[in-house]
Each structure stands twice: as structure tokens, then as C-alpha cells.
């Protein structure tokens, strides 16, 4: 297992599969997307990333989904952070939450290979998909709930789809939403979000 020394006092050492889903729409400017990436990397610095502890995936979504890091990628935490920092700014007209939740359900969590770990999708959303794309939204959220995947929506800015955020929250008590007025609030909320995710994950059982 490839490990590196902790970079911060708070360091989440739990059994967790965490997926970062980044809104690639033009509702975020290129500069705002830079702040979003910095937030993801800052969060990753506070996780004990390894195949044994916290596994991470990073996906940018627009009308489709682009995975930059997969849960099973065996790389040093610093290398994974470097890859996350290089996520491309798509600036597309549409970012489909339905499509990315479908991708999370059928691609990322198609097989549950770590039943002992918590599964969380951190949905960073700043836009609203067209109604025609959201027909199966609830179905995908329910599918994720069946697979015990907690969905944590982080609404960013005035165009985040509050209706979808509320629908996600209704599906499970753990699906706590964070609604921010802009990317400038991400840094302020970071520690609270990391703590919340970490508290949802089990500690490793003591060695027998």
C-alpha cells in the first residue's frame, strides 16, 4: 500500500470510497473552476488515501462524464492530487447531474468490492440540467441508495439546481446538502465537509 506522511493535523483514516463529481458547465467560469479544483485537492490532502483506507475517484461531468481517477488506481496520494489538479475546464453549456449519477451507479459502483467501506459521492453542482435530461434522476438516486452510496450535494452559486438537491436529501438522512452562494465559500466549508464525510465512514477493525 503506497502511503505518504499526513499533510495536516486533521487526517481522515477511515474505510471510505469517495467520488468527487465536478460540474464542468460554463455556469462556473474558468477561474471559479480553478477554485473548485483547489478545493478538491485540499480535501484530498486531508484523507488517508490508499487502497486500504480512503479510495478516491475524480469525475468531471458535462453532457457526459470524464473520469480522471478511478477508485482502483494504485498511485501515490501526491500523484493522485496532481492528476486532480489537472482536470480540464470544459465550460460546456450543459452539466448533467442525471448522467453523472448514472455513471456513478453503473460504472464506479457497478461491483461493490469493499462492502466494509462507506461509499460516498460528493456532487459538486453549479448548474441545472435541461428537464429532458433529468427524467431518470430520482431513479439513479434511488439506485445509489440501494447500493448504500451516500450522495452529498454541494450546491454552488445562484444556478445550482435546488430542486434536485432537495430530492437527493429526501432519499436518505445521510444525504446532507451544503448550499454555498459562491466558490469563495468552499474553503470556509471544507473542514466541515471533510469531517462530515469522515464521520460517515467506519474505522478499521483492530487487528486480530
Amino acid at each position: 500500500d503506497i502511503s505518504e506522511p499526513p499533510l495536516h493535523d486533521f487526517y481522515c483514516s477511515r474505510l471510505l470510497d469517495l467520488v468527487f463529481l465536478l460540474d464542468g458547465s460554463s455556469r462556473l467560469s474558468e477561474a471559479e473552476f480553478e477554485v473548485l479544483k483547489a478545493f478538491v485537492v485540499d480535501m484530498m490532502e486531508r484523507l488517508r488515501i490508499s487502497q486500504k483506507w480512503v479510495r478516491v475517484a475524480v469525475v468531471e461531468y458535462h453532457d457526459g462524464s470524464h473520469a480522471y481517477i478511478g477508485l482502483k488506481d494504485r498511485k501515490r496520494p501526491s500523484e493522485l492530487r496532481r492528476i486532480a489538479s489537472q482536470v480540464k475546464y470544459a465550460g460546456s453549456q450543459v452539466a448533467s447531474t442525471s448522467e453523472v449519477l448514472k455513471y456513478t451507479l453503473f460504472q464506479i459502483f457497478s461491483k461493490i468490492d469493499r462492502p466494509e467501506a462507506s461509499r460516498i459521492a460528493l456532487l459538486l453542482m453549479a448548474s441545472q440540467e435541461p428537464q429532458r435530461m433529468s427524467r431518470n434522476f430520482v431513479r439513479y438516486v434511488q439506485g445509489l441508495k440501494k447500493k448504500k452510496v451516500i450522495v452529498i450535494p454541494v450546491g454552488i452559486g445562484p444556478h445550482a439546481n435546488l430542486k434536485q438537491i432537495r430530492l437527493i436529501e429526501k432519499q436518505a438522512p445521510e444525504n446532507k446538502a451544503f448550499v454555498l452562494s459562491s466558490v469563495d465559500e468552499l474553503e470556509q466549508q471544507r473542514d466541515e465537509i471533510v469531517s462530515y464525510l469522515c464521520d460517515l465512514a467506519p474505522e478499521a477493525p483492530p487487528p486480530t
Epitope: 467560469s29 474558468e30 477561474a31 480553478e34 479544483k37 483547489a38 485537492v41 489538479s85 475546464y89
Partner: nanobody, 126 residues
């Protein structure tokens, strides 16, 4: 290859304004995110401001509201308008460019920028 040349730095009094320019040559300028960094004597180089290919901007907290980064794609130039200058703004100011809009990194880290100018000295006296 991108070449960057800064200009506009000089000695000014506290409270004055100054505009730095960074002229770029060598490739498609309009698609490149750019930034200004600065290095004060005896200190490490630090991030000042960022401008995306869409002209969206970011600033370090100490200059927000006083400095403005802008770009003129027709002239292949990025500017840093500095107002209400303070003695603590004294530094060599460097212009930096990404290698492309799509190979990036964290905006406030030096390693995210492939191309650098030689720097221009700004001195603010009290």
C-alpha cells in the same frame, strides 16, 4: 514556446498607482490562462492574480480590491493595474503562463505555470 516580457515597474510613493504589462509571443495567446506572481526580498515567490482564457479572474486576499488583472488578446498582453500601493507591495513582479488551457494545476502554485518572464521591479516607498 512562449516568451513573456514584463514592463512598467518603477519606484513610486505609497498610495500611488502603477500598471504592469506582460507581452507574450510565440503561440495562441488567447487560450492561455495567465497569472502574476511576486517575490519580495528574502521571501518566496507568491501568487498575486490569475486570469482565465475567458477573462475570469482570481486574486490573493491582500491585493483584492486594489489590483486588477486584465488581458488584451489583440495585443497579446496581460496587465496588472495596481492602485493604492503599499510598502509591502515592494517586490519583483513576474508574469506566468500555462502551457495550454488544458494542462493546468492549482492556480496559486508556481509549478502550474510552464512559462515565466524575467520580472519587473516595483518599489513602494513610504
Amino acid at each position: 514556446e512562449v516568451q513573456l516580457v514584463e514592463s512598467g515597474g518603477r519606484l513610486v510613493k505609497a498610495g500611488a498607482s502603477l500598471r504592469l504589462s506582460c507581452a507574450a509571443s510565440g503561440r495562441t495567446f488567447s487560450s492561455l490562462p495567465m497569472a502574476w506572481f511576486r517575490q519580495a526580498p528574502g521571501k518566496e515567490r507568491e501568487f498575486v492574480a490569475f486570469i482565465g482564457s475567458d477573462s475570469s479572474t482570481l486574486y490573493t486576499s491582500s491585493v483584492r480590491g486594489r489590483f486588477t488583472i486584465s488581458r488584451d488578446n489583440g495585443k497579446n498582453t496581460v496587465y496588472l493595474q495596481m492602485m493604492n500601493l503599499k510598502p509591502e507591495d515592494t517586490a519583483v513582479y513576474y508574469c506566468a503562463a500555462r502551457s495550454s488551457a488544458f494542462s493546468s494545476g492549482i492556480y496559486y502554485r508556481e509549478g502550474s505555470y510552464a512559462y515565466w518572464g524575467q520580472g519587473t521591479q516595483v518599489t513602494v516607498s513610504s
